[in-house]
Amino acid sequence: EKAMVDGSWLDLAKRSKLEAQPFAHLTINATDIPSGSHKVSLSSWYHDRGWAKISNMTFSNGKLIVNQDGFYYLYANICFRHHETSGDLATEYLQLMVYVTKTSIKIPSSHTLMKGGSTKYWSGNSEFHFYSINVGGFFKLRSGEEISIEVSNPSLLDPDQDATYFGAFKVRDID
């Protein structure tokens, strides 16, 4: 019986530690996509509706803030699309890019952790165009560091929650 009690306590401890593991999955807020044809920062994301969730991390001023030191897996998926019903592309040659950036407040600095994308030729003869970028990587992050997303040509972003999102989850502590 004692062994069973110890076992269940161990399970509970494990479970509570898992529940405390920081994670975030943020989806684009389609009502507030910035304009611009160059690189712009995406600052409006959902954290508590649909697929979006956050735990033991903070979302503030368009940035995902780390609350616990650790090794994290970061990911971002960005979809670009254009349908002729919305008008014509002013240029058919496009650079469609995403940049995942880490900003440190303590030692003011900013680093691009990941970037992805391509130059595309989206011919005016086609009714519909679509392009998806997915980046992911394993990074050591410290409490207070902030993760943000920049993209080119935000007017072409696919606003669906299953198309444009980013997130992070802690994998292990820093030894």
Epitope: S37, G87, D88, T91
Partner: antibody, heavy 126, light 103 residues
Framework: QVQLVQSGAEVRKPGASVKVSCKAS????????IHWVRQAPGQRLEWMGW????????KFSQKFQGRITVTRDTAASTAYMELRSLRSEDTAVYYC???????????????????WGQGTLVTVSS | EIVMTQSPSSLSASVGDRVTITCRAS??????LNWYQLKPGKAPRLLIY???SLQSGVPSRFSGSGSGAEFTLTISSLQPEDIATYYC?????FGQGTKVEIK
């Protein structure tokens, strides 16, 4: 205030060419596209083509492809539309119109024509 | 190619009347639909863009509604200066126009 001022009326013989100008003022010419639209007597408005005043890119209606040239002079903030091999059915009022999309803020030509020129009557008659 | 069809082609109404013009697209165009007013010898004027957004400077008696393939332009209280031909438009396609006259 934004203004588009077009050149005066023209009379041409069939087979000839006509070039209509559209001078823009009151905004940054290079940040917007200019469309050309015409209306023949008793007919609906008909879109002909556009030019991105910033980079000179153009797009034309299939109907006019090969007969139309649209150019711009950014220094003069002026767009030009030339139509060649004129026939009597080309008798119409030709309008230039500004696309409402600011190219500095995005890359989609939205086909919202927020400002128009006063129109240029082109008469094709032998 | 999308075709825009307006109805009626002409109408006659009294000052103060509520006037409705319909525009149908041959396929769904979401809300990408604009309305213009054309008076003889004058530059066309954008009234409504994106199906329901009122262009700045346009009187509030003009309103637009609809999405998909069916749209309407409404003049809530017809005024003498509203005598004109009205056109709906989606990108490269215009409707055939509706001529509005005063009874």
């Amino acid at each position: 205030q934004v203004q588009l001022v077009q050149s005066g009326a023209e009379v041409r013989k069939p087979g000839a060419s006509v070039k209509v100008s559209c001078k823009a003022s009151g905004y940054d010419f290079s940040n917007y596209a200019i469309h050309w639209v015409r209306q023949a007597p008793g007919q609906r408005l008909e879109w002909m083509g556009w030019i991105n005043a910033g980079n000179g890119n153009t797009k034309f209606s299939q109907k006019f492809q090969g007969r139309i040239t649209v150019t711009r002079d950014t220094a003069a903030s002026t767009a030009y539309m030339e139509l060649r091999s004129l026939r009597s059915e080309d008798t119409a009022v030709y309008y230039c119109a500004r696309d409402s999309s600011n190219m500095a803020r995005g890359i989609i030509i939205a086909y919202y024509f927020d400002y128009w020129g006063q129109g240029t009557l082109v008469t094709v008659s032998s | 190619e999308i075709v825009m069809t307006q109805s009626p082609s002409s109408l006659s109404a009294s000052v103060g009347d509520r006037v409705t013009i319909t525009c149908r697209a041959s396929q769904s165009i979401s809300r990408y639909l604009n309305w213009y007013q054309l008076k003889p010898g004058k530059a066309p004027r954008l009234l409504i863009y994106g199906a329901s957004s009122l262009q700045s400077g346009v009187p509030s008696r003009f309103s637009g509604s609809g999405s998909g393939a069916e749209f309407t332009l409404t003049i809530s209280s017809l005024q003498p200066e509203d005598i004109a031909t009205y056109y709906c438009q989606h990108t490269r396609a215009f409707g055939q126009g509706t001529k509005v006259e005063i009874k």
